[in-house]
């Protein structure tokens, strides 16, 4: 049994880091493998993660962590029984994938303005809480070409757009994702999408 693709890990910078790897053949990850992880920290204890299958030869492990600070560094040992298959380390602050925003809502009753709001996925005491920026994706269910991205570079989790920038009388969907420049993170997953029917009063034309 050998590791074909070494573990790569990403952290949500809160409580979970996710490590994925591939073996050289079909593997029952949960029965054959264990990923041991330990904070490089005087008198810390090692913890064991039981991996799950992620495709035939792929494995994934969700490492539970006590918060995350920038100095954190973990040692990782991948074991198959008594055999050490791989040894490495992981610094969560250097591999951050933020949690996805939630509770995306479209408010359509504000004088021909669409107000999109969502929730910051972090509690106020987490470092990322004040460092997230967002991308909002809006698309038409009827017209695949009608697909747009709005970059929200301020901290407030909301976006206002004129309803008239979208076509009237058709349904749209929106979703939002987050990233943090301070840690050069990857983008989060997209939030679940929300749907609304776009309608607005055409401006009265004067001749």
């Amino acid at each position: 049994m050998k590791v074909l693709q070494e573990p790569t890990c990403v952290s949500d910078y809160m409580s979970i880091s996710t490590c994925e790897w591939k073996m050289n053949g079909p593997t029952n990850c949960s029965t054959e493998l264990r990923l041991l992880y330990q904070l490089v920290f005087l008198l810390s204890e090692a913890h064991t993660c039981i991996p799950e299958n992620n495709g035939g030869a792929g494995c994934v492990c969700h490492l539970l962590m006590d918060d995350v600070v920038s100095a954190d560094n973990y040692t990782l040992d991948l074991w198959a029984g008594q055999q050490l298959l791989w040894k490495g380390s992981f610094k969560p602050s250097e591999h951050v994938k933020p949690r996805a925003p939630g509770n995306l809502t479209v408010h359509t009753n504000v004088s021909d303005t669409l107000l999109l709001t969502w929730s910051n996925p972090y509690p106020p005491d987490n470092y990322l809480y004040n460092h997230l920026t967002y991308a909002v994706n809006i698309w038409s269910e009827n017209d695949p070409a009608d697909f747009r991205i709005y970059n929200v570079t301020y901290l407030e989790p909301s976006l206002r757009i004129a309803a008239s920038t979208l076509k009237s009388g058709i349904s749209y969907r929106a979703r939002v994702r987050a990233w943090a420049q301070c840690y050069n993170t990857t983008w989060s997953e997209w939030s679940p999408s929300t749907k609304w029917h776009n309608s607005y009063r055409e401006p009265f034309e004067q001749h």
Epitope: F41, L42, L43, S44, A71, D72, N73, K91
Partner: antibody, heavy 120, light 108 residues
């Protein structure tokens, strides 16, 4: 209420021994690494020794290595420090301290301290 | 072994003023953690800041920590009468624990 209560301090002659105890209440000792920190009269804080939550690993400052032994009895929620070959410079208030991993070494609960005096 | 040096040794200020306490490490700190403690006469120390900048439970927001590498700072934005005490920085690393020698904050 989370509390640590040290006992076992006293007056001892140079070369003698003492065993300090620390009783924990209000939390489960087995979830935490535990440490001893001391403070000589009118001086600053000095780290002495620590033990991992399971008791499987220990650490000692160079000044006490080979003379002091830290141990724990998790079912009894008690921490110990066995001190031998005591010297005058070991005279101090000894604090039992809890370290929360989430606090990254921050010692969030301290006992009131027990005084050890080494003198002839 | 890393040595922590605190400065100044004594700081004399008045209530309402801003206090800035320094802690310098003899070598750079990457995978290690800095904490700050307050100690009043006859009492055990109290944890103020951990992980360089995070306030411990129940600590007022006038206390803040910052820094990286070798230089770390504890700032008390507006001194209250109860803040006059001795302050210690502490390094908790992979292989050792070290305290600074302390800074005494006294009323001017």
């Amino acid at each position: 209420e989370v509390q640590l209560l040290e006992s076992g301090g006293g007056l001892v002659q140079p070369g003698g021994s003492l065993r300090l105890s620390c009783a924990a209440s209000g939390f489960t000792l087995s979830s935490y690494a535990m440490h001893w920190v001391r403070q000589a009269p009118g001086k600053g804080l000095e780290y002495v020794s620590g033990i991992s939550s399971s008791g499987s690993s220990t650490y000692y400052a160079n000044s006490v290595k080979g003379r002091f032994t830290i141990s724990r009895d998790n079912p009894k929620n008690t921490l110990f420090l066995q001190m031998s070959s005591l010297r005058a410079e070991d005279t101090a208030v000894y604090y039992c301290v809890r370290v929360k991993v989430a606090y990254r070494g921050g010692m969030d609960v301290w006992g009131q301290g027990t005084t050890v005096t080494v003198s002839s | 072994e890393i040595v922590l040096t605190q400065s100044p040794g004594t700081l004399s200020l008045s209530p309402g003023e801003r206090a800035t306490l320094s802690c310098r490490a003899s070598q750079g700190i990457s995978s290690a953690y800095l904490a700050w403690y307050q100690q009043k006469p006859g009492q055990a120390p109290r944890l103020l800041i951990y992980g360089t900048s995070r306030r411990a439970t129940g600590i007022p927001d006038r206390f803040s920590g910052s820094g990286s590498g070798t230089d770390f700072t504890l700032t008390i934005s507006r001194l209250e009468p109860e803040d006059f005490a001795v302050y210690y920085c502490q390094l908790y690393g992979a292989t050792s624990v070290t305290f600074g020698q302390g800074t005494k904050l006294e009323i001017k």
